[in-house]
Interface confidence: low
Amino acid sequence: QEGPLPRPSISAEPGTVIPPGRPVTIVCRGPVGVDQFRLEREDRSKFNDTKDVSQASPSESEARFRIDSVSEGNAGHYRCLYVKSTRWSEHSDYLDLVVKETSGDTDSPVTEPDSSAGPTQRPSDNSHNEHAPASQGLSAEHLY
């Protein structure tokens, strides 16, 4: 009997608080070998499936769901699940995407922190302008 599939994680880049008209990417992560990720809205009334799965680290795969220009209609709670070897995983935690104007220059990157389900620190291409990592077992998105 196969054991339970690892629970996926969910995060948003550059953050979970996004000004209207700005892009956001919701990232779902699971184990290596995932066949398909699904991103669901809170009530499951809307979902988006993708088989465009990449290796995020030696032990993780990921899918990226990009919204090019967010609006109030994109605000809400999202969660991920995946299919591996014909089995569905359980759901990730919810991610709360907030769409609102932020103070200051909206042309600059959104610097508000992600939710607790957000991404961990990761190595950088130019370590002087990104966070340094805590350890290897983290997102390797920077490598893509």
Epitope: P58, P123, S124, D125, S127, G137, A140, L143, Y144
Partner: antibody
């Protein structure tokens, strides 16, 4: 089977130009960062350049030794990687390898560049 | 830039013995370190990634350890085909620097 095949090497005079190509197959090219690594005769390995994916705006990075002279590019529709080399110097003489990111897990067989007058 | 200092530059050993190669990073790199083997006239081959993880198809006599700034690579029960050159590389930040290499020779 993953394959990376470099072409375009040859003999070039100093200050000349050359473009290397890398044809790839057997994996999903457009979701992988790609790199060029070189090795001068009898010397060690030197990372040259890297290009990220479309999701990351095709960001590029270069070794200081080639910055402003070399340009890395990719054609996701053809699963091709390129390295345009300008203002070549004798110290650029090396075997050039196309390498799949992110973990440098697949390398091409290499193509030789000789810069000499 | 991060400097990678690999030692020794060359080492002699006998068949069946074990050897250890060390790589020191000039600043902390977590475990963003890889080890490669290169045979004469061939392309490098990934052996170890993430400092300790064995790449697909690599025999278990190869192993890696370490984190932060000090890393080790061990080959146990040396076989004839192991007497080639090995490199470490940091993948923490660009430029992705390599160590200078270690050439293993039969004693």
């Amino acid at each position: 089977e993953v394959q990376l095949v470099e072409t375009g090497g040859g003999l070039v005079q100093p200050k000349g130009s050359l473009k290397l190509s890398c044809a790839t197959s057997g994996f999903t090219f457009n979701i992988n960062a790609m790199n060029w690594v070189r090795q001068a005769p009898g010397k060690g390995l030197e990372w040259v350049a890297r290009i990220r994916t479309k999701n990351n705006n095709f960001a590029t990075y270069y070794a200081d030794s080639v910055k402003d002279r070399f340009t890395i590019s990719r054609d996701d529709s053809q699963s091709m990687l390129y390295l345009q080399m300008n203002n070549l110097k004798t110290e650029d003489t090396a075997m050039y390898y196309c390498v799949r990111g992110p973990y440098f897990d697949y390398w091409g067989q290499g193509t030789t560049l000789t810069v000499s007058s | 830039d991060i400097q990678m200092t690999q030692s020794p530059a060359s080492q002699s050993a006998s068949l069946g013995e074990s050897v250890t190669i060390t790589c020191l990073a000039s600043q902390t790199i977590g475990t963003w370190l890889a080890w490669y083997q290169q045979k004469p006239g061939k392309s490098p081959q990934l052996l170890i990634y993430a400092a300790t993880s064995l790449a697909d198809g690599v025999p278990s006599r190869f192993s890696g350890s370490g984190s932060g700034t000090k890393f080790s690579f061990k080959i146990s029960n040396l076989q004839a085909e192991d007497f080639v050159t090995y490199y470490c590389q940091q993948l923490y930040s660009t430029p992705y620097t390599f160590g200078g290499g270690t050439k293993l020779e039969i004693k």
